[in-house]
């Protein structure tokens, strides 16, 4: 699998998204992970509901939202004022018993907020109140990683 | 306007089969954007979710864990309804069946799901 | 399963009396939660869907309102058609359970 890299603004939201064969997939869950370490395990953040014909419904776990397009074969994960910490690697799963595959790798990566929000008390922020439908969403910027590029950065 | 008519006897023997019939009017039992129910209520149990059929380009059904083992709910294309079978049943098992139609809601988007439209219920006893 | 708990079992009040019945869930549920009117041997009537939103139809009087494991239904103004029974409902688990009823009478 290769990597594909989601940009998001700091404050913001971010919508990734993970396409995959509606057939091949079908009748399964989906989850969103963050992996931990290169060799680590996948850490479950999220998965859509646990019956199947309501996977549509958006799922959420604190500021993470995922949905599932089963006829169209589109998972949908939106971060949800994304900080600092949000960044790193995640995976995109399809569960069947007690194993799971993997839809879509990714990076996110959180980019600094131009205008920094954190010195402009008098601009809206989404409150915890607000739903992930109220929240704007950013068109994420995309890329997969290019051959040669090393998803995990060895450690000194 | 969407109805559901319920059919089937109202008396089964302990250890058979419950054979129930939803037809459907002014929807389809194909329709990617609903699913099919039976809930069941007794004074005893309340009202209780049984399972659901649906068609996302193939059929698939889910059941509640406590029927889970006895229960099958089918499609009839051809004349756009759909049925429940509950075997072995016991005495527990006597209560008022309804059909329902379960469906998204619009607004919020992605957020409700609900039973909308409910079949006039039959009431089935159990007993030899 | 989820399990949820309305209070209270039943209640007596008077046309146009502000009606509160409350439906409580073993767990965190979101806003996954519905509302249905029930008149004895009639099938039950979706009045809220997703905690909060009225159902086309249903009359503005009814109202929905929480979120996570404490909700409540609102009648502002009872009418004599609203002498029923109410239940609530969660989609939240894979088996759909329903709390097990309000009894709203005549005083």
């Known amino acids: 699998h290769n990597t594909t890299v989601f940009q998001g603004v700091e404050g913001q939201s971010l919508q990734v998204s993970c396409p995959y064969d509606s057939m091949k997939h079908w009748g399964r869950r989906k989850a969103w992970c963050r992996q931990l370490g290169e060799k680590g395990p996948c850490q479950r953040v999220v998965s859509t509901h646990n019956l199947w014909l309501l996977s549509f419904l958006r799922r959420r776990n604190g500021s993470t939202a995922i949905t599932d397009d089963t006829l169209g074969g589109t998972l949908t994960i939106t971060l949800r004022n994304l900080q600092p910490h949000d960044a790193g690697f995640y995976q995109c799963q399809s569960l069947h018993g007690s194993e799971a595959d993997t839809l879509r790798k990714v990076l996110v990566e959180v980019l600094a907020d131009p205008l920094d929000h954190r010195d402009a008390g008098d601009l809206w922020v989404p409150g915890e109140s607000e739903s992930f439908e109220d929240a704007h969403v950013e068109h994420s910027i995309s890329r997969s990683l290019l051959e040669g590029e090393i998803p995990f950065p060895p450690t000194s | 306007q969407v109805q559901l008519q319920q059919s089937g006897p109202g008396l089964v023997k302990p250890s058979q089969t419950l054979s129930l019939t939803c037809a459907i009017s002014?929807?389809?039992?194909?329709?990617?954007?609903?699913?099919w129910n039976w809930i069941r209520q007794s004074p005893s149990r309340g009202l209780e979710w049984l399972g659901h059929i649906g068609y996302r380009s193939k059929w698939y059904n889910e059941y509640a864990v406590s029927v889970k083992s006895r229960i099958t709910i089918n499609p009839d294309t051809s004349k756009n309804q759909f049925s429940l079978q509950l075997n072995s049943v016991t005495p527990e098992d006597t209560a008022v069946y309804y059909c329902?139609?379960?469906?998204?809601?619009?607004?919020?988007?992605?957020?409700?799901?609900?039973?909308?439209?409910w079949g006039q219920g039959t009431l089935v006893t159990v007993s030899s | 399963d989820i399990q949820m708990t309305q209070s209270p079992s039943s209640l007596s009040a008077s046309v146009g009396d502000r009606v509160t019945i409350t439906c409580r869930a073993s767990?965190?549920?979101?806003?996954?939660l519905n509302w249905y009117q029930q008149k004895p041997g009639k099938a039950p009537k979706l009045l809220i869907y997703?905690?909060?939103n009225l159902q086309s139809g249903v009359p503005s009087r009814f109202s929905g309102s929480g979120s996570g494991t404490d909700f409540t239904l609102t009648i502002s103004s009872l009418q004599p058609e609203d002498f029923a029974t109410y239940y609530c409902q969660q989609y939240t688990d894979e088996s759909m359970t329903f709390g097990q009823g309000t009894k709203v009478e005549i005083k």
């Open positions: 997703a905690a909060s």
């Open positions: 329902a139609r379960g469906m998204y809601g619009s607004v919020p988007y992605k957020e409700g799901y609900y039973f909308d439209i």
């Open positions: 002014g929807d389809s039992v194909s329709s990617s954007s609903a699913a």
């Open positions: 767990q965190g549920i979101s806003s996954d």
